[in-house]
Interface confidence: medium
């Protein structure tokens, strides 16, 4: 009969750092022997080989030595794959391909997950608050995967959707730190709750803050944007937040929304006559049409480039009108510095050497700091140059000229002033005579 390969329909969910089993089974015919079996596990999209069994033998892992079959169960038709120490990068579809005389395959999805920490809450300003004051409440939760869903609500459980800015930044392991900012005009008093949900684990992490201001509210309808610049990494998408307070009975037919570059007044995107007029900015912008009626005039800017940096004006007119400008700050992390030494052999105390620290493709221009092994800054005889490429990203080369002591460690720190990201490199020169790199 025909060979049938079966895998679970639902994704296999695995916590980062644990082991996962990707189930796959087939129905062996009577008289089947493992010598007849050719089993291939591969990544569905890239077709990268993961593990295989052929000619009656396990051919081993081709995937970072973290996979294994269940050899004692193969003859019964169990072709499952064990994946050890699961990483975020493992997420995706794995194809189990079984051939004997006939053949078949099926793909199983691996969904990686990591729980988020209990959120911490901060308030700015955090004293002398009065009704009508605008406050910024920040909710931060760490080391989760996949990206979280963040929900804000007031003391009555009513969702707060306007003026929320959520950023999620992945670390080297692919785990996300979530920072969600709620800007709110204070009422007489209020409780504000933040819930960070892991959509895969259905795990909720909660925190709340209660604010009791000093007197009754005052305030006016206005167009609101974040005070702080929106920071966006090159190549990612950015949301330029803008909101207005629609009056009762407001309809989109009444709205005229214009986004433009503040300085040049170049049109970026518009909405008029109840219709999105589209992007006038390299087809990389979009509104949130379903949210406009609630007063959300935010703009999505896709595939951010260095050249996008600057001020964008959100202009809203209904019967009255208003506008506000939001700044976009573009950033790109610097690479880990590479260190070179000249001369790099037969070095002796008293020799003058040139140590070059190079870091690439960052933005904006870096701050470069040198220090010795004791952490003492080295400021003399440092020359730093930064050259922008066609995309506007900077390559940094910093040269330190130093007279060698008996031994010494020289560290270079390249700081991205916007991301507050530090990239370090160091070189240790010891012995007499000395060479670089040190010989094994």
């Amino acid at each position: 009969g025909a060979l049938e390969v079966q895998v679970p329909e639902d994704p296999v969910v695995a916590l980062v750092g644990t082991d996962a089993t990707l189930c796959c089974s087939f129905s062996p015919e009577p008289g089947f022997s493992l010598a007849q079996l050719n089993l291939i596990w591969q990544l569905t999209d890239t077709k990268q080989l993961v593990h295989s069994f052929a000619e009656g033998q396990d051919q081993g892992s081709a995937y970072a030595n973290r996979t294994a079959l269940f050899p004692d169960l193969l003859a019964q038709g169990n072709a499952s794959l064990r994946l050890q120490r699961v990483r975020v990068a493992d997420e995706g579809s794995f194809t189990c391909f079984v051939s004997i005389r006939d053949f078949g395959s099926a793909a199983v999805s691996l969904q990686v997950a990591a729980p988020y920490s209990k959120p911490s809450m901060t308030l700015e300003p955090n004293k002398d608050l009065r009704p009508g004051d605008t406050v910024t409440i920040t909710c931060s939760s760490y080391q989760g995967y996949p990206e979280a869903e963040v929900f804000w609500q007031d003391g009555q459980g009513v969702p707060l959707t306007g003026n929320v800015t959520t950023s999620q930044m992945a670390n080297e392991q692919g785990l996300f730190d979530v920072h969600s900012i709620l800007r709110v005009v204070l009422g007489a008093n209020g409780t504000y709750s933040c819930l960070v949900r892991n959509p895969v684990l259905q795990q909720d992490a909660h925190s709340s803050v209660t604010i009791t201001p000093q007197r009754s509210p005052t305030g006016a309808v206005e167009v609101q944007v974040p005070e702080d610049p929106v920071v966006a990494l090159v190549g990612t998408d950015a949301t330029l937040r803008c909101s207005f307070s629609p009056e009762p009975g407001f309809s989109l037919a009444q709205l005229n929304l214009i986004w433009q570059l503040t300085d040049t007044k170049q049109l970026v995107h518009s909405f008029t006559e109840g219709r999105d007029q589209g992007s006038a900015y390299a087809n990389r912008t979009a509104l949130f049409p379903d949210l406009l009626a609630q007063g959300n005039a935010s703009l999505r800017l896709q595939r951010v480039r260095v050249a996008d940096e600057g001020s964008f004006t959100c202009f809203v007119s209904i019967r009255d009108f208003g506008s506000a400008a939001v700044s976009l700050q573009v950033a790109a992390p610097y690479s880990k510095p590479s260190m070179t030494l000249e001369p790099n052999k037969d070095l002796r105390p008293g020799d003058t050497v040139t140590i070059t620290c190079s870091s690439y493709r960052g933005y904006p221009e870096a701050e470069v700091f040198w220090q010795d092994g004791q952490g003492v800054p080295l400021t003399g005889n440092v020359t730093t140059s930064q050259m922008a490429n066609e995309q506007g990203l900077f390559d940094v080369h910093s040269v330190l000229r130093v007279v060698l002591g008996a031994n010494g460690t020289y560290s270079c720190l390249v700081r991205n002033p916007v991301l507050q990201q530090d990239a370090h490199g160091s070189v240790t020169i010891t012995g007499q005579p000395m060479t670089f790199p040190p010989e094994a």
């Epitope: 009969g1 025909a2 060979l3 049938e4 390969v5 007849q36 079996l37 050719n38 291939i40 591969q42 077709k47 080989l49 295989s52 052929a54 051919q59 194809t95 391909f97 051939s99 004997i100 005389r101 006939d102 053949f103 078949g104 395959s105 099926a106």
Partner: antibody, heavy 120, light 107 residues
Framework: QVQLQQSGGGLVQPGGSLKLSSCAAS????????MSWVRQTPDKRLELVAT????????YYSDSVKGRFTISRDNAKNTLYLQMSSLKSEDTAMYYC????????????WGQGTTLTVSS | DIVMTQSPSSLSASLGDRVTISCRAS?????LNWYQQKPDGTVKLLIY???RLHSGVPSRFSGSGSGTDYSLTISNLEQEDIATYFC??????????FGGGTKLEIK
């Protein structure tokens, strides 16, 4: 003995469609084997166009035909089919059906071939 | 997809000669098969999994190789061996790929 008898083919205009051939199988348990369509272009190169497993649950296509060609089988009739649409001149070829043998991934029996010409 | 490089593209030999055709690819783990196509278009499997003779194929045909380099040898060329020969890799999933062919003629 194993036999694969092809029919179909012919002349089709660019952009046109054709349910090329059927391939009628005999001499073996049809539903137990994968089947394939292999074509030979005028420059005599062979290209595996599409493959289907025994119960029809898995299909595979070359990038050059993906989205345009559909391989199917009727195990009750012991017949293999290839539906072709949006035909291009580069689809002009001799089309062979072949039995695909599993674990070593070879084609152990071939049909006699049928010619498809895509031309205006 | 894996690219199969077959050589030579054509070759002329005398009856009784020993003939060798080569096929090169990335590492295909011995999943290399050889086919014969007669001038009338008929295609037959000769060898599968590098060196295993398909049933009914004369023993003068043999295959060898490993890793990236494989070859088909006809030890004692006969008139009926006049044909074009193709290699094919069966590594990983379909679509499997063929070499460009070697046309064998009699001197």
């Amino acid at each position: 003995q194993v036999q694969l008898q092809q029919s179909g083919g012919g002349l089709v205009q660019p952009g046109g469609s054709l349910k090329l051939s059927s391939c009628a199988a005999s001499g073996f348990t049809f539903s137990s084997y994968g089947m394939s369509w292999v074509r030979q272009t005028p420059d005599k190169r062979l290209e595996l166009v599409a493959t289907i497993n025994g119960n029809g649950g898995n299909t595979y296509y070359s990038d050059s035909v993906k989205g345009r060609f559909t391989i199917s089988r009727d195990n009750a009739k012991n017949t293999l089919y290839l539906q072709m649409s949006s035909l291009k001149s580069e689809d002009t070829a001799m089309y062979y059906c072949a039995r695909s043998y599993g674990n070593y991934h070879y084609f152990d029996y071939w049909g006699q071939g049928t010619t498809l010409t895509v031309s205006s | 997809d894996i690219v199969m490089t077959q050589s030579p593209s054509s070759l002329s030999a005398s009856l009784g000669d020993r003939v060798t055709i080569s096929c090169r690819a990335s590492d295909i783990r011995n999943y290399l098969n050889w086919y014969q196509q007669k001038p009338d278009g008929t295609v037959k499997l000769l060898i599968y999994y590098t060196s295993r003779l398909h049933s009914g194929v004369p023993s003068r045909f043999s295959g060898s190789g490993s890793g990236t380099d494989y070859s088909l040898t006809i030890s004692n060329l006969e008139q009926e061996d006049i044909a074009t020969y193709f290699c094919q890799q069966g590594n990983t999933l379909p679509p499997w790929t063929f070499g460009g062919g070697t046309k064998l003629e009699i001197k």
